[in-house]
Amino acid sequence: NIDVCKLGTVTVQPAPVIPLGSAANISCSLNPKQGCSHYPSSNELILLKFVNDVLVENLHGKKVHDHTGHSSTFQVTNLSLGMTLFVCKLNCSNSQKKPPVPVCGVEISVGVAPEPPQNISCVQEGENGTVACSWNSGKVTYLKTNYTLQLSGPNNLTCQKQCFSDNRQNCNRLDLGINLSPDLAESRFIVRVTAINDLGNSSSLPHTFTFLDIVIPLPPWDIRINFLNASGSRGTLQWEDEGQVVLNQLRYQPLNSTSWNMVNATNAKGKYDLRDLRPFTEYEFQISSKLHLSGGSWSNWSESLRTRTPEEEPVGILDIWYMKQDIDYDRQQISLFWKSLNPSEARGKILHYQVTLQEVTKKTTLQNTTRHTSWTRVIPRTGAWTASVSAANSKGASAPTHINIVDLCGTGLLAPHQVSAKSENMDNILVTWQPPKKADSAVREYIVEWRALQPGSITKFPPHWLRIPPDNMSALISENIKPYICYEIRVHALSESQGGCSSIRGDSKHKAPVSGPHITAITEKKERLFISWTHIPFPEQRGCILHYRIYWKERDSTAQPELCEIQYRRSQNSHPISSLQPRVTYVLWMTAVTAAGESPQGNEREFCPQGKAN
C-alpha cells in the first residue's frame, strides 16, 4: 500500500538510482494551497538524510535553488553504496513550537552496473533430473539486478528462466526445468547468463556442454552385502543403479580407519566380489557411479552401508607367562597368565580359553576352560611340566601356545648382569642388562616382568611382562607404569629347560617421600641399640626408596646429629647402632631418600642406653 504525498512532491535528478561517486539534485515542491496557512512567504523547506531509517544529517547547507515558499532544490554528494532515504519537511518559521511537518520522502539507491557473469556450471542430477545452472555474479551491485539464463540446443531448442538479486536475496542459480535425455548424448548445448539493472547490463560468454558433461548419475541405492558361506573375509556387495551406468567406484574401510580401500568396477551391473575383508570388523561401504568410461562426472557417494563381517577362527599365538610358588615340600602352585589376542588375531569374540598343564614323563594332564586371562593350579613339585593355552571363538580355536614350566630364578649362571632401570619420562622406564656370563645353555628369550611394590600386589594384580628376543638387551616398559610408584622389575633369561633372573627396582618419576619411617621401638642388646620402624605408607613413598637414614644426637645438644645410612630392603625393619654413650639421653629419628631427595624426619624417640651392668 503506497501512501500518497499529500503536501507536495519530491523528485530526483538525474534519477533515483545513481552510480557510485555521482551527485544528485533533490527538488521538493509544495502542492497548491499547501504550506504555512497565514504566511506563505514563511514556508521553509528543509531536507533530512536518513540511513537505516535513522536521522544522520540536516542538509540545510546543501540548498542550490530556492523559490521562497514554494520549492527548493538540494544537491547531495558522497552517497554511500546502498539505499538512502531523504525526507523533505516544511518548517513554518513563525511558529517556534510546532516542529517541521514531513512533506514527502524519496529513496536514492547508489550502486554499480553488473559485471559479466562468469564460471557458468550446469548439472542434471540423474537421467530423469532437470538442468540447473549456477554462476558467479561478480561484485555486489547494491541494486535490484535481474538475471536471465538462456539455453539453446539442437532442433531449435530454446529455454529461459529469470531471477533477481537484491539486498534480501541472491540470484546465482536457476533450474530450467527441462530434462536432457540420453538420446541427445552427442548434441551440443549453449547457455548464456545476462544481468540487467538500472545502471547497465552485461552478458556472460557462451558456455557449451554435452549431455555427458552435465549429467551426474544419482548415487547408487539399496546397498547390501552377502558373505559367502558366512565367510569373514569374502563378500558380494550388491546395489541398485540407474540404467545407463557403466562404471562404479567402490570404497570401503574399517570404521576406525582413516584411509579407504578403492576399487573400480566396469559393467558391474550392481554386483562386486570383495576378497580381502578382515573378519569380525565393522566396515563402511560406499559406491559412486559414472555414465561413461572416459567422460562425464562421478555421482555423489551413496549413503554408507555399515556392517560387521562374520567371525573366523582365531589366528596368532597367545603370549603366556607364569609364576611358581612352593606350597610345601612336595606341592607347588602354578599361576598361568596370558595376554588377550588383538582384534585382528582374535577374529571374533573370544568365548573361552583352553588351558592344559601336562607332566611330560608321566603323561599326567590337567585340562580346563576359562573365560579369564589367568589360571591357577596346585601340582606336584616333581616332574617336568609344560603348559599350553589356546583361544576359542564361535568358529574355532587358535593353535595352542606351549611354555615349559621351569624354575624361573633357579640357575644363577643364567642370571642377566648389570641390570639397570632408568626413568625415560612420566610413563615409561628403560630397562637394560647384559647377558649371563657363563650360561651353559643358550638363552632362547628374555622376559622383563614388573609389578608395583605395594602391599598385596602379588596376590591382587597379575604381573606385566614383555618378551624380548635373545639378541636384545633392553626394553622400554610402559604398560601400567604410573609416576611416583616404585616397581619391582625382573629380567628373566630362559633356556629350553632352565631360567635365571635378576631383580631391580625402578620408577618413571620420583619426588622426595612425604614422611620418614616411624620408629616403633629401641631396644638394647649387648651394648648395641636396635632401632625398629614401620615402613612409609605406600602412597607417601613417591618413588623407589634408595636408603633410610637414622639420625641421633644428645638430647640438649646443638651439635649436628650423627647418622647411619642403610641400604633400603623391603624385608628389613630394624638396624643396630653401637656408637652411643651409656647413661646419656639421645634423641633419634629417621628419614627416607629417593633419587629426588630426602623426606622430612619421622617421629622422634628418646633413649638412654644403660651400657654394661655393674
Epitope: 501512501d3 500518497v4 516542529p99 520522502g105
Partner: nanobody
C-alpha cells in the same frame, strides 16, 4: 519537540525477564512511530521493535521474535518493551526512539527516527 525518558533497565540472570518503559512528551505527530533500538559494545545500533499509529503490525527483529513484545499506550504516551527468556547476547544499552511516519515516493510510508532517549543498560549474565 519530543522528549523521551527510558526506565526499567538492570541486571538479570540468563532466562530471566525485564520490562522497559519509555515516556514521551511533545508533538504527537513527530512521534507517530515509537520503537526500541539497542547497541552492544563494539557493535552497530540495531532496531529491535517498532510500533506505529498507522494500524500496522509491530515490527520485530529476528533476534528477538517470540521473546520480546512491544506495547503502546497512546493515552498515556508510553511505549513498553516486555523482554522474556533473556540471553547473555541481549546485553546492551537500550534506547527508546521516536519519529514521524513519512510518505515516500513510489513505496509504502516509512517510520523514521529523529528523537532519542538517553539509553538504559540491560545486563544478562549466564
Amino acid at each position: 519537540q519530543v522528549q523521551l525518558q527510558e526506565s526499567g533497565g538492570g541486571s538479570v540472570q540468563d532466562g530471566g525477564s525485564l520490562r522497559l518503559s519509555c515516556a514521551a512528551s511533545g508533538d504527537i505527530y513527530a512521534r507517530n512511530c515509537m520503537g526500541w533500538f539497542r547497541q552492544a559494545p563494539g557493535k552497530e545500533r540495531e532496531k529491535i521493535a517498532v510500533a506505529d499509529t498507522g494500524g500496522r503490525s509491530p515490527y520485530y527483529a529476528d533476534s528477538v521474535k517470540g521473546r520480546f513484545t512491544i506495547s503502546r499506550d497512546n493515552a498515556k504516551n508510553t511505549v513498553d518493551l516486555q523482554m522474556n527468556s533473556l540471553k547473555p547476547e541481549d546485553t546492551a544499552v537500550y534506547y527508546c526512539a521516536a519519529g514521524p511516519l513519512v510518505p515516500v515516493v513510489n513505496t509504502a510510508a516509512r517510520c523514521v527516527y529523529e528523537y532519542w532517549g538517553q539509553g538504559t543498560q540491560v545486563t544478562v549474565s549466564s
